[in-house]
């Protein structure tokens, strides 16, 4: 999929909502200039496309939500890449600017053909994209045209700044909260010396910055901090791993504020360099409980502790999604490509038949095989519902007593819609309350996951705790099985009695050498020895001085 031909999924309606999903992986470094995207993605791509289509169907059939108004959508592929997403957002804007009287918009239909839609409706709002860096670029464009944007997984703290990102909202919390959760885990296990890695880009950079700031306040030292692009080559990952190895055996814990594919790159490098079991990775929600991160590299990932946004599976989505087949799905223009990629077979005779596969797909194939629901599915659906409720509230206030779109609502004013969205308050897909604070952010609840070997060659993520509004709960026995197994990640061991810490010039405060005080000195504080005054001597525990008792010599006393 390259820049000259972009596929769009379109669903007709009275009001059109735009969406940006990473239907394909980002371009590899050598393909960035031509914006040629990678392989099709299931969880982050196809499932989210289907979630949009089916959620709109549910909204449209709900008589209490936007009665007499049909919501439609236009879904575009962001490829998890700023340049591609910007190009696609410009298309959204173009649609909004083209007047139906002046020009016809050309759209790529879900069946793959080109078709002219007279009076192409403008996009009233945009759902997504997933990546913070990409969301920022998209927001910079959308806000110029007063188009509200609701994100489902862009968690960067920068996006809370309403002076910069006025039309941005999200159904997920800011990363400041998960940075705090990560620091709380490090504190809990007394890891005072850790290495740090983050994905180059806004998500990783701002998240790691918060992690480092909070760590410093808690007396946690960062051995060294590294950054790397998610799509960096093998050599870059190998180089990074060698640097991390240089801090062993002291910095065993590696805090990774990373996108999932960065973690996968690290795991692959561990395999190449034979470093399985050398590190314990503490990962942010970019990793969470994704199997596409660990598949094939489970041994390297074992022990990993990850943060996952709390979002239970959505049953009704699976009921819908697992029935989909190439014969039953022609509104999703990427579905045939995905089916062939998923089952490594050729859909013989179908419009998007891929001849690179030798085997023909047979009728017994089903998505039920090895199905894993996108971990952020609930957020995607909540973002779509937020847009619907915002429009519903707007319609109620602008068109009282009127079912459908009244003249006062046409064309939809983005400023009024934003106001309405910010006041939205409804019960989300998992029964939780969805609301937005003054920054357009949602409250934060996280699950703590642990990647474990459950049996011979069987690995899985286990829920070992939670972090909710500043409170960390962990099942230590589940993580470590016994206290002695707790990994140590410290630069220097505590000094013995009568010793002080000497920090070498240029070293962090967690690394020291222990030096004993002189015979007449006591430990004044952990860094200083002080001599006892004349007539006094260090106490047995060397924490102070006792006066030397005066002994008078008598004529008959033996020689001392």
């Amino acid at each position: 999929q390259s820049s000259e031909r972009r596929v769009v999924a379109h669903m007709p309606g009275d009001i059109i909502i735009g969406a940006l999903f990473s239907v394909h992986h980002q371009p590899t470094v050598d393909k960035v200039h031509e914006r040629k995207c990678g392989a099709v993605r299931e969880q982050y791509g196809i499932q989210r496309v289907e979630a949009m289509l089916h959620t709109l169907e549910r909204i449209n059939s709900d008589p209490t939500l936007l009665p007499n108004i049909t919501l439609g959508c236009e879904i575009r592929d962001s490829c998890w890449h700023s340049a591609v997403a910007l190009e696609q957002s410009i298309e959204f804007i173009r649609d909004s600017l083209i007047s139906s009287e002046e020009e016809e918009g050309l759209v790529r239909c879900v069946d793959g053909s080109s078709s002219s839609f007279r009076s192409k409706k403008p996009i009233v709002g945009v759902i997504g994209p997933g990546s913070s860096s990409v969301a920022i670029q998209v927001q910079n464009l959308l806000q110029l045209f007063n188009i509200p944007q609701i994100a489902y997984s862009a968690t960067s703290m920068d996006l809370s700044d309403k002076t910069l990102f006025k039309y941005f909202m999200r159904v997920v919390p800011s990363d400041a909260q998960q940075a705090r959760a990560m620091v709380d885990i490090v504190k809990r296990y007394n890891w005072t010396y850790v290495s740090a890695v983050h994905t180059e880009g806004n998500y990783g950079e701002s998240g790691m910055e918060a992690f480092k700031d909070m760590s410093a306040k808690e007396g946690i030292c960062i051995a060294h901090s590294y950054k790397i692009y998610s799509n960096a080559g093998e050599q870059s990952f190998d180089k990074l791993l060698k640097k991390l190895t240089s801090h062993l055996p002291k910095a065993r814990v590696v805090a990774c504020f990373c996108e999932g594919m960065t973690v996968r790159g690290l795991l692959m490098a561990m395999r190449r360099l034979g470093l399985a079991g050398e590190f314990l990775l503490l990962g942010s929600d970019g990793w969470a409980d994704r199997y596409d991160v660990t598949d094939g590299y489970q041994r390297e990932a074992v022990g990993g502790i990850t943060i996952k946004l709390q979002s239970p599976d959505v049953k009704w989505f699976d009921d819908y999604y697992l029935k989909l087949r190439p014969e039953t799905n022609h509104r999703n223009p990427w579905f045939q490509e995905f089916w062939q990629h998923r089952f490594q077979c050729r859909l013989e005779g179908f419009p998007q038949e891929n001849s690179k596969y030798n085997k023909t797909c047979n009728s017994s194939l089903t998505l039920k095989t090895h199905h894993v629901q996108d971990s952020k599915m609930g957020f995607v659906i909540n973002a779509i519902y937020s847009m619907a409720y915002g429009l519903h509230n707007m319609q109620m206030s602008l068109c009282p007593g009127y079912a459908g779109l009244c003249d006062a609502m046409k064309p939809i004013d983005g400023r009024k819609l934003l106001e309405s969205l910010m006041k939205t308050n409804f019960t989300g897909v998992s029964g939780d309350t969805i609301l937005f604070d003054e920054n357009g952010d949602s409250p934060g609840r996280y699950e703590i996951m642990n990647f474990k070997e459950m049996g011979k060659d069987y690995f899985d993520y286990i829920n070992v705790g939670s972090w909710d509004n500043g409170e960390l709960k962990m099942d230590d026995d589940e993580v470590w099985s016994k206290k002695s197994n707790i990994i140590r990640s410290v630069c220097s061991e505590p000094c013995e009695k009568g010793q002080i810490k000497v920090i070498r010039k240029g070293e962090v405060s967690c690394c020291w050498t222990c030096t004993p005080c002189k015979e007449n000195e006591y430990v004044f504080d952990e860094y200083t020895c002080k001599a006892c005054q004349l007539g006094s001597w260090p106490t047995d525990d060397l924490t102070g001085c006792d006066l030397i008792p005066v002994q008078y010599l008598r004529w008959g006393d033996p020689e001392p």
């Epitope: 014969e327 022609h330 013989e348 023909t360």
Partner: antibody, heavy 117, light 110 residues
Framework: SLEESGGGLVKPGGTLTLTCTAS?????????ICWVRQAPGKGLEWIGC??????AYNANWAKGRFAISQTSSTTVTLQMTSLPAADTATYFC?????????????WGPGTLVTVSS | AYDMTQTPASVEVAVGGTVTIKCQAS??????LAWYQQKPGQPPKLLIY???TLASGVSSRFKGSGSGTQFALTISDLECADAATYYC????????????FGGGTEVVVK
Amino acid sequence: SLEESGGGLVKPGGTLTLTCTASGFSFSSSYWICWVRQAPGKGLEWIGCIYGSTDAYNANWAKGRFAISQTSSTTVTLQMTSLPAADTATYFCARHDGDIGWTLDLWGPGTLVTVSS
Amino acid sequence: AYDMTQTPASVEVAVGGTVTIKCQASLTIGTRLAWYQQKPGQPPKLLIYKASTLASGVSSRFKGSGSGTQFALTISDLECADAATYYCQQAAYVTDIDNAFGGGTEVVVK
């Protein structure tokens, strides 16, 4: 082979259930079983299909009044409600077995349904 | 919605002649098209699937072609036994369909 049964005379507004029975094979999870009808002197009209035992799909015009279900490993039914005279036709069931797509390679002889008062 | 348009509705051809029936899909279906032959009082019989593949036991005088939205069935060296009604059917999708079959073409052999 396939054989349809349950056809006959029914009054307008009535309900009728047709059954498609397989002989020599049973409906597995990879079969498409479809219903097609043909009004006297007219062309073939696709009603809908069922894939496996649960997933049924109807033509746009057949949604609501026509329901396809698998009742056993060798029978599939077509339930028709609120029948108008225009539903008078020969009803065929047909099977697709093979790769993706649903070309119908095995047909039953058909059963005639007459809707008249 | 998917529907199929078949032309002509009826055609008369002499024995030994050639006839071409056309079928148009409203949206692209790749090569997922089948052709059936139906004689009075009988169920349809599959002739061609995947636009051009002959079903087993079908004479090579029947030839299917096309892809995307435009398809054709050509019968050469017509025989009296070929007198029948021929239908095309899109065999790609089972959702959002008005009719999977074309309207039919009656072939009369003189």
